[in-house]
């Protein structure tokens, strides 16, 4: 079966939207009205990976772009990046582990844990217009909870 994907936008728990910040970075900021059109639309693909009770493995691509969020070590630290891929080969059922996130969805709140680096989560800062990053703490200053809005 082909990989099933859905199109969505994500907002963090403070209702900050995610937008492009240069060619290979996302940032989180509050948007209103027409500015909401700036937010990135993700293509969330359901992929094969390790499953546990509340975790569903997904890959997060940017709709109509050959870019995927991926997790790599940079200077010995797990780091979130946007990685360019060959659109002829992606998405695929068995994505490389760096592209896989465990989607944890409880009461309409979502977390995205890196499959490559367990206990590291897609995170945003409390401050405005800061980069989206991979954070190693939940429930601290940084925000790891998101809501998802379906896009047709």
């Amino acid at each position: 079966a082909p990989v099933r994907s859905l199109h969505c936008t994500l907002r963090d728990a403070q209702l900050k939207s995610l937008v492009m910040s240069g060619p290979y970075e996302l940032k989180a900021l509050h948007l209103q009205g027409q500015d909401l059109e700036q937010q990135v639309v993700f293509s969330m693909s359901f992929v094969q990976g390790e499953e546990s009770n509340d975790k569903i493995p997904v890959a997060l691509g940017l709709k109509a772009k050959n870019l995927y969020l991926s997790c790599v070590l940079k200077d010995d630290k797990p780091t979130l990046q946007l990685e360019s891929v060959d659109p002829k080969n992606y998405p695929k059922k068995k994505m490389e582990k760096r592209f896989v996130f465990n989607k944890i969805e409880i009461n309409n709140k979502l977390e995205f844990e890196s499959a490559q680096f367990p206990n590291w989560y897609i995170s945003t800062s409390q401050a405005e217009s800061m980069p989206v990053f991979l954070g190693g703490t939940r429930g601290g200053q940084d925000i790891t909870d998101f809501t998802m809005q379906f896009v047709s």
């Epitope: 359901f46 992929v47 997904v58």
Partner: antibody, heavy 120, light 111 residues
Framework: QVTLRESGPALVKPTQTLTLTCTFS??????????VSWIRQPPGKALEWLAL???????YYTTSLKTRLTISKDTSKNQVVLTMTNMDPVDTATYYC????????????WGQGTVVTVSS | QSVLTQPPSVSEAPRQRVTISCSGS????????VNWYQQLPGKAPKLLIY???LLSSGVSDRFSGSKSGTSASLAISGLQSEDEADYYC???????????FGGGTKLTVLG
């Protein structure tokens, strides 16, 4: 803890319609990537998949029984209902509901099953 | 007639290793994940292996799965009497647009 429980009549007469309910807890069918399925097993025989419903209300049916089956969900009640029309003695089986997840499409948690006998 | 083909029965002595085969086609095993289930007598099936070779939570590592082309196999090492059960393979089938099961294999642990 994820659990699923099937309920419905133990005995139905030929030509009648069977209605089975799967009540689940520990997960939500509004969670993207979640599915619930019905599978049956006639006495001493193999497992046979019947129907599937996913978080977005997409429905899938086994080809041979498509005209007789209807699957639906009530997300607020955490229930999935299967109806099967025009029951026949060959439909006598244990009917299971099970959770499935999108990536692996594996039935990872099963109910205990409910035995349905079709006889006049 | 099941879409996936399994041997009806296999038997082996305790502490030995046994493999159960599952044969399909390009529309199911060839292009989709294979999952394996154990059904103990009188019980509901239980997921053992998913995504061809991943062990389900709480399952003994005596069980392992593999896949090559349009065939898959389940291996059980260090056989124990409690492994006596029916074993089913399953995979999504793109032609039928739904999951398909094998006919099941009855494992007997001798002695």
């Amino acid at each position: 803890q994820v659990t699923l429980r099937e309920s419905g009549p133990a005995l139905v007469k030929p030509t009648q319609t069977l209605t089975l309910t799967c009540t689940f807890s520990g997960f939500s069918l509004s969670t993207s990537g979640m599915w619930v399925s019905w599978i049956r097993q006639p006495p001493g025989k193999a497992l046979e998949w019947l129907a599937l419903i996913d978080w977005g209300d997409d429905k899938y049916y086994t080809t041979s029984l498509k005209t007789r089956l209807t699957i639906s969900k009530d997300t607020s009640k955490n229930q999935v209902v299967l109806t099967m029309t025009n029951m026949d003695p060959v439909d006598t089986a244990t009917y299971y509901c099970a959770r499935m997840r999108e990536g692996s499409r594996a039935f990872d948690i099963w109910g205990q099953g409910t035995v349905v006998t079709v006889s006049s | 007639q099941s879409v996936l083909t399994q041997p009806p029965s296999v038997s082996e002595a305790p502490r030995q290793r046994v493999t159960i085969s599952c044969s399909g086609s390009s529309s199911n095993i060839g292009d989709n994940a294979v999952n394996w289930y154990q059904q103990l007598p009188g019980k509901a099936p239980k997921l053992l292996i998913y995504n061809d070779d991943l062990l389900s939570s709480g399952v003994s590592d005596r069980f392992s799965g593999s896949k090559s082309g349009t065939s898959a196999s389940l291996a059980i090492s260090g056989l124990q009497s409690e492994d006596e059960a029916d074993y089913y393979c399953a995979a999504w089938d793109d032609s039928l647009n739904g999951p398909v099961f094998g006919g099941g294999t009855k494992l007997t642990v001798l002695g």
